[in-house]
Interface confidence: medium
């Protein structure tokens, strides 16, 4: 062994462990024949106090006893909780150049006596588990503190276990390693916890319990479900349980749900029938167990069983809409569209749709199946046609949904009045209207249909629509509505055999267009100028264009330009103006206006009319 303290010793009175607020005396003594050579009287012993490796105090002034050149005693007070290091050094005062030499050191631990442990609680997990107890230790002692857990019961049963707390680990739980069996169900057991450290000891109050108080059954295992006759709504949930279980709690929910269905089952013996399941739905099932109807604790929830219920035939009605386009004098193209059933109606994976087009009088029938949500056919323009669509999964088909094919905008008397479209926010548009004024027949329903006004949208994109009851005069449209895009919105009024419609354009948010129209040509005809232009590219329109403005002024003039404003029509791309002087060179340009404002000007064109003055 190497002796770090070969020069002397350091001792502490009353002990190296003291209660908070107490003082201690530290004595530093030199061994015989150690010290400053030849001059024992020049030996000076000093005591240094370190906290976390930092020298915080030279205790020279705390010296309470001194045997010159041999030993010194220092009193230390106001020590903080935890550990403090004291090092004694020898200073040979006749040799100023040599630093003090370490003699020895000591650590003093400051702490508190343990408080009585409280809130003892014991559990035994499962009939074959072991008893484990936990408690609240109270205030931190800052010292190594031993805890003893003692259990006593009938037939002189005694058992104890120990653990300790220090600044590295906490002891507030112990497993006694013994098993209480159900035949002791009525017996009473007592546990207490004793805490002891260098500054004192304390005991908890005795805690009394019975077998039923502390035994928590193991969670059920091997959970499975059997669907009766492959039913999607009825199934028998089965599981394994410990033998003594008398009560179970079942909980189940669709995976995307936030609330559980709860069921209590008494004496279920590992089996329970469920009758209210949704077909073709991912469910999560869990079970908990209890050993006694009134007392005892519930087990933890079992591991989840996740499974999908079987399919059942679809229910509900498909939402169908259509478009008619005349091809020539005796043929028309019918495009049928329908919306997918929601999962609770589809009740399985929709494999295909059965589509039927029937001419009522001649009994001509066209039938097909498709996996898509649209179907197009060319049929004669004559006759009264009706369409029906049904959805099929592996278990069957939904009832067909019928719709009469009428001329959707054929009857002016059925056209809704005062149609307006107002932007509500970035994602939707409020459409309102008044009923037709002089309808021959009663309106059965309104259809609000909308489509982005962009090139090819009629052929590329299916329409979006909403069915509105006949007593409603408004609709909030939001499906596929994006800001800064103009939509053509049609409100159809449908009777049994006729249709009328009104059209309006609308947007959910708008800005001034990015650019103005591009003037492509200026031509002179019969003393009038015709201005031709190309429309602003779709992405640059940034909403519904309300009108175009044509500006002109004499070249080199500083006067305000003249202008005419044209109501926007998608089909129009030229306009006449007739107030220009002949043989005067003019500069012309155009802008576009949305509800948010006017675009920058488009290209400028110069033109000098040749005709007579108007």
């Amino acid at each position: 062994n190497i002796d770090v303290c070969k020069l002397g010793t350091v001792t502490v009175q009353p002990a190296p462990v003291i209660p908070l607020g107490s003082a201690a005396n530290i004595s530093c003594s030199l061994n015989p024949k150690q010290g400053c050579s030849h001059y024992p009287s020049s030996n000076e012993l000093i005591l240094l106090k370190f906290v976390n490796d930092v020298l915080v105090e030279n205790l020279h002034g705390k010296k309470v006893h001194d045997h010159t050149g041999h030993s010194s005693t220092f009193q230390v007070t106001n020590l903080s909780l935890g550990m403090t290091l004291f090092v004694c050094k020898l200073n040979c005062s006749n040799s100023q150049k040599k630093p003090p030499v370490p003699v020895c050191g000591v650590e003093i631990s400051v702490g508190v006596a343990p408080e009585p442990p409280q809130n003892i609680s014991c559990v035994q997990e499962g009939e074959n588990g072991t008893v484990a107890c936990s408690w609240n230790s109270g205030k931190v002692t800052y010292l190594k503190t031993n805890y003893t857990l003692q259990l006593s019961g009938p037939n002189n049963l005694t058992c104890q276990k120990q653990c300790f707390s220090d600044n590295r680990q906490n002891c507030n739980r112990l497993d006694l390693g013994i098993n209480l069996s159900p035949d002791l169900a009525e017996s009473r057991f007592i546990v207490r916890v004793t805490a002891i450290n260098d500054l004192g000891n304390s005991s908890s109050l005795p805690h009394t319990f019975t077998f039923l108080d502390i035994v928590i059954p193991l969670p059920p295992w091997d959970i499975r479900i059997n669907f009766l006759n492959a039913s999607g709504s009825r199934g028998t949930l089965q599981w394994e349980d410990e033998g003594q279980v008398v009560l179970n709690q079942l909980r189940y929910q669709p995976l995307n749900s936030t609330s559980w269905n709860m069921v209590n089952a008494t004496n279920a013996k590992g089996k329970y029938d469920l009758r209210d399941l949704r077909p073709f739905t991912e469910y999560e099932f869990q079970i908990s167990s209890k050993l006694h109807l009134s007392g005892g604790s519930w087990s933890n929830w079992s591991e989840s069983l996740r499974t999908r219920t079987p399919e059942e035939e679809p229910v509900g009605i498909l939402d169908i809409w259509y478009m008619k386009q005349d091809i020539d004098y005796d043929r028309q193209q019918i495009s049928l569209f329908w919306k997918s059933l929601n999962p609770s109606e589809a009740r399985g994976k929709i494999l295909h749709y059965q589509v039927t087009l029937q001419e009522v009088t001649k009994k001509t029938t066209l039938q097909n199946t498709t996996r898509h949500t649209s179907w197009t056919r060319v049929i004669p323009r004559t006759g009264a046609w009706t369409a029906s669509v049904s959805a099929a999964n592996s278990k069957g088909a939904s009832a067909p949904t019928h719709i009469n094919i009428v001329d959707l905008c054929g009857t002016g008397l059925l056209a809704p009045h005062q149609v307006s479209a107002k932007s509500e926010n970035m994602d939707n548009i409020l459409v309102t209207w008044q009923p037709p004024k002089k309808a021959d027949s009663a309106v059965r329903e309104y259809i609000v249909e909308w489509r982005a006004l962009q090139p090819g949208s009629i052929t590329k994109f299916p329409p979006h629509w909403l069915r509105i009851p006949p007593d409603n005069m408004s609709a909030l449209i939001s499906e596929n509505i994006k800001p800064y895009i103009c939509y053509e919105i049609r409100v159809h009024a449908l009777s049994e055999s006729q249709g009328g419609c009104s059209s309006i354009r609308g947007d959910s948010k708008h800005k001034a267009p990015v650019s103005g129209p591009h003037i492509t040509a200026i031509t002179e005809k019969k003393e009038r100028l015709f201005i031709s232009w190309t429309h602003i590219p779709f992405p640059e329109q940034r909403g519904c264009i309300l009108h175009y403005r044509i500006y002109w002024k004499e070249r080199d003039s500083t006067a305000q330009p003249e202008l005419c404003e044209i109501q926007y029509r998608r089909s129009q791309n030229s306009h006449p103006i007739s107030s220009l002087q002949p043989r005067v060179t003019y500069v012309l340009w155009m802008t576009a206006v949305t509800a948010a404002g006017e675009s920058p000007q488009g290209n400028e064109r110069e033109f000098c009319p040749q005709g007579k003055a108007n």
Epitope: F50, N52, C104, G105, E107, D166, N167
Partner: nanobody, 118 residues
Amino acid sequence: QVQLQESGGGLVQPGGSLRLSCAASGRAWNEYNMGWFRQAPGKEREFVALIWWSSGNTYYADSVKGRFTISRDKVKNTVYLQMNSLKPEDTAVYYCAAGPTFNKYEYWGQGTQVTVSS
């Protein structure tokens, strides 16, 4: 079986740095002090630095104070000695030791050679 295993020694130029490691295994060290000692050829083994495993308090020989730093990693059960501004007189075999009090060491490692030379 209790074991202290030093590593990290080697040849270094004056003014250079080295980091020694001492891996402690075979028991709980919570109530122990861990120290570094060194022994130069023909000299007695001398104390270098000390750390209390539980509190992390440290203590150094005056000859290394400000140049050497002792630390410990409780998770890895390892004590380190970071040696900076090394001098030729720091040349020695460095030993790791463990003991229950300030001046008593029960377990020793095999040592690792540190040579400071240009």
